[in-house]
Interface confidence: medium
């Protein structure tokens, strides 16, 4: 496999826009949810105040074959400065509680909305 040339880039998305787009995608997931999200798959709960973006990705990346969260997984991969692979838990320092993907998405959405309201686009 040879990969020459990255995806076309119209310019960097400002952090505030990137965060808003992620929030919109999570809203979309929660509103369109009919059957249990990702067949009720369980993921590790994360500390939403500690290196949240990589931790969220490290948790969600272990869910495969769930088209509903594929875009979220892609978006989060751009929010994390290091490459994340399934089974990697470098940011998930504490792995003690598993929750359903649907609950994980709701918790993440609430936290991101709070950050957005407070203008924390870091």
């Amino acid at each position: 496999l040879t990969c020459l040339g990255g995806f076309a880039s119209p310019g960097p998305v400002p952090p505030s826009t990137a965060l808003r787009e992620l929030i919109e995608e999570l809203v979309n997931i929660t509103q369109n949810q009919k059957a249990p999200l990702c067949n009720g798959s369980m993921v590790w709960s994360i500390n939403l105040t500690a290196g949240m973006y990589c931790a969220a990705l490290e948790s969600l990346i272990n869910v495969s074959g769930c088209s509903a969260i594929e875009k979220t997984q892609r978006m989060l991969s751009g929010f994390c400065p290091h490459k994340v692979s399934a089974g990697q838990f470098s940011s998930l320092h504490v792995r003690d509680t598993k929750i359903e993907v649907a609950q994980f998405v709701k918790d993440l959405l609430l936290h991101l909305k709070k950050l957005f309201r407070e203008g924390q686009f870091n």
Partner: antibody
């Protein structure tokens, strides 16, 4: 042993384009993001962008996004950084550097000096 | 775009303690900025000291530590050695790009 070996120094005229290569060994290039950093003489460090060599997805710094293109050739384990429309203030050392959680920016190329002069 | 500011220069006595800070123009630095600290000596590539706010690289001496202090990222050098004289840079991640700090020249005198 992990190594990042960059192409040699370049002297170019304003308006030209430079292409710098970064050949990696000791690991598979698709396993980690590759970042590029600029350092002008006597100045600080500037992040230019990064690539996921696995799928070619890139992120660029706002300052450089309209002039920089970062690519990767997985068949030769080589990353590239192309900077176009060169001006005198682009005279700098350019570094490629590997990033992963357990060793962010732990491995650096030796640097490539680009001199832009008419 | 955010601006990341550091003290231009700091002087520390051998064996003394000095704290370098890294301020973000957009507000408080958090763990989601994945703060990195680098040391650079003349003619050399930068070397990572601290990553992810407070994790030491394997080669980083225990006298260097990273933290969050009053809304800023901080690098504390306790028990300074002559070989610690160098330029120090921080880098903060802003959701989809890094920004390096302006750099601090540390003199051990």
């Amino acid at each position: 042993e992990v190594q990042l070996v960059q192409s040699g120094a370049e002297v170019l005229k304003p308006g030209a384009t430079v292409l710098i290569s970064c050949k990696v060994s000791g690991y598979t290039i698709t396993d980690y993001y590759m970042h590029w950093v600029q350092q002008a003489p006597g100045k600080g460090l500037e992040w230019m962008g990064r690539i996921d060599p696995e799928d070619g997805e890139t992120k660029y710094a706002p300052k450089f996004h309209d002039r920089v293109t970062i690519t990767a050739d997985t068949s030769t384990d080589t990353a590239y950084m192309e900077l176009s429309s060169l001006r005198s203030e682009d005279t700098a050392v350019y570094y490629c550097t590997r990033y992963d959680y357990y060793g962010p920016f732990a491995y650096w190329g030796q640097g490539t000096l680009v001199t832009v002069s008419s | 775009q955010a601006v990341v500011t550091q003290e231009p220069s700091l002087t520390v006595s051998p064996g003394g303690t000095v704290t370098l800070t890294c301020r973000s123009s957009t507000g408080a630095v958090t763990t989601s900025n994945y703060a990195n600290w680098f040391q650079q000596k003349p003619g050399q590539a930068p070397r990572t000291l601290i990553y992810g706010t407070n994790n030491r690289a394997p080669w980083t001496p225990a006298r260097f530590s990273g933290s969050l202090l009053g809304g800023k990222a901080a690098l504390t050098l306790s028990g300074a050695q002559p070989e610690d004289e160098a330029e120090y840079y921080c880098a903060l991640w802003y959701i989809n790009h890094f920004i390096f700090g302006t750099g601090t020249k540390v003199t051990v005198l």
